[in-house]
């Protein structure tokens, strides 16, 4: 919980309030929404970030809410329950006692039920496929340069261990980044691939979570890499349990961003 001791701020999470009243008189930064102290030397968990996002002042809540059957992804936005370590609780419920089970990145992996629904364990998302389409450029990017730049980004900006970036695929204009991290591979202190993917997602959308840093300026050999579409697929260690009706329509958990 030691964060930029001199001015007591959280470099890795601007959705915090920091004060010098942590253990040993150190700077302590609390996530908005939950009030949990976060470790500012690493990424904050996605659960706490979502909770902070939902607690932030709502600027535009006067628009019509589309039907719940509308086939546009809702950004995965909800006010989640987080465990004492800041991870998603396996079972999530809304204000009307509708409950569902989620995976380690907070994506629903069962049909919705009532308060009797049981979610025995938090199922780990061990494989994340980030599918990007970049804006037209003069020519295609060099694949090895692109690969190196994206690996550098995940290593340096998100502090994700290089071994968890399994592959970078490229067929102009589509870029695919594969992140893999089994339960057995993740050591204490390792950044979670779900958290890294969420920070990347927010960076790509121009909503950086980092304090004071400029937005993401992705360049490959000096050429700007501008993303115009993002699709993220989450694969769990245990397959999701949806009804057959749903499975015929949705083969993956995915979030679609424009």
């Amino acid at each position: 919980h030691t964060a930029a001791q001199d001015n007591c701020t959280c470099p890795t999470n601007k959705m915090t309030v920091c004060s010098p009243d942590g253990p040993g008189g150190r700077c302590q930064c609390r996530a908005l929404g939950s009030g949990m102290a976060v470790d500012c030397s690493t990424l904050t968990s996605k659960c706490l970030l979502l909770k902070a996002r939902m607690s932030a002042p709502k600027n535009a809540r006067t628009l019509v809410r589309p039907s719940e059957h509308a086939l546009v992804d809702n950004d995965g936005l909800y006010d989640p329950d987080c465990d004492p370590e800041g991870r998603f609780k396996a079972r999530q419920c809304n204000q009307t006692s509708v409950c569902w089970c989620v995976n380690s990145v907070g994506v629903r992996r069962t049909d919705k039920g009532d308060l009797s629904l049981r979610c025995d364990e938090l199922v780990r998302t061990h494989h994340i496929l980030i599918d990007l389409r970049h804006r037209p450029t003069a020519g295609a990017f060099n694949h090895s340069d692109l690969d190196a730049e994206l690996r550098r980004l995940f290593r340096e900006r998100y502090r994700l261990h290089p071994k968890f970036v399994a592959a970078v695929h490229y067929e102009q204009p589509t870029i695919q980044i594969e992140l893999r991290q089994n339960t057995s591979q993740k050591a204490a202190g390792d950044v979670d691939i779900g958290d890294a993917a969420y920070y990347f997602e927010r960076d790509i959308k121009g909503e950086s979570l980092f304090q004071g840093r400029g937005g993401l300026d992705l360049r490959v050999r000096g050429e700007p890499l501008q993303v115009e579409r993002t699709l993220i697929y989450y694969l769990d260690e245990i397959p999701p349990k949806f009804s057959m009706k749903r499975l015929t329509h949705h083969h993956h958990h995915h979030h679609h961003h424009h």
Partner: antibody, heavy 115, light 107 residues
Framework: QVQLVQSGAEVKKPGASVKVSCKAS????????IHWVRQAPGQGLEWIGT????????VYNQKFRDRATMTADTSISTAYIELSRLRSDDTAVYYC????????WGQGTTVTVSS | EIVLTQSPATLSLSPGERATLSCRAS??????IHWFQQKPGQSPRLLIK???ESISGIPSRFSGSGSGTDFTLTISSLEPEDFAVYYC?????????FGQGTKLEIK
């Protein structure tokens, strides 16, 4: 030295509002949380909420969310709590306290709600 | 919300004896527990922060221990002025809560 000095006792009728102040001195007011706690006669301590003066970010105990309003005036290093629609069971001593571990407390403000 | 349960509700001891007060949290809160003493007509006074950190001006006979869900405040040798009500409080996440208190009375 650090001091939190609260406003004086109040007697209110049910349905009325009360505003209690807490003037801080001896430290940087903007960089520490101010918490509000109350204690009904013969009862334990109950956390009402907290405010961070530098940006006025406030968090409320769900129980008080609809009736309590915490504010802070950094120009005079003073925090306030206003409680509306008072009921007889709001009769209590109201305290302000500093930091997450409540290292300094005000002397308390007795609020009596009676018809 | 996190519930803090203090035990015993009342503790009857004599000056010079050792007092052990317990506070149990409903979930893991690390070391985010703080202990207070309150005497009639007075504001509470911080005794221990973050489970075991001592506070300037508080006598060394007061000590704290524990982490996770179980915490203890120990007064090594009771002085007459120690008879009061003791509260634990957590600051793990919002809402902060207090235990219901332990009354330490003279036997």
């Amino acid at each position: 030295q650090v001091q939190l000095v609260q406003s004086g006792a109040e007697v209110k009728k049910p349905g009325a509002s009360v505003k209690v102040s807490c003037k801080a001195s001896g430290y940087s007011f903007t960089t520490h949380w101010i918490h509000w706690v109350r204690q009904a006669p013969g009862q334990g301590l109950e956390w009402i909420g907290t405010i961070f003066p530098s940006n006025a970010y406030a968090v409320y105990n769900q129980k008080f969310r609809d009736r309590a309003t915490m504010t802070a005036d950094t120009s005079i290093s003073t925090a306030y709590i206003e409680l509306s629609r008072l009921r007889s069971d709001d009769t209590a001593v109201y305290y302000c306290a500093r930091a997450s571990y409540f290292d300094y407390w005000g002397q308390g403000t007795t609020v009596t709600v009676s018809s | 919300e996190i519930v803090l349960t203090q035990s015993p509700a009342t503790l009857s001891l004599s000056p010079g004896e050792r007092a052990t007060l317990s506070c149990r949290a409903s979930q893991n809160i690390g070391t985010s527990i703080h202990w207070f003493q309150q005497k009639p007509g007075q504001s509470p006074r911080l005794l221990i922060k973050y489970a075991s950190e001592s506070i300037s001006g508080i006598p060394s006979r007061f000590s704290g221990s524990g982490s996770g869900t179980d915490f203890t405040l120990t007064i090594s040798s009771l002085e007459p002025e120690d008879f009061a009500v003791y509260y634990c409080q957590h600051s793990h996440s919002w809402p902060f809560t207090f235990g219901q208190g332990t009354k330490l009375e003279i036997k």
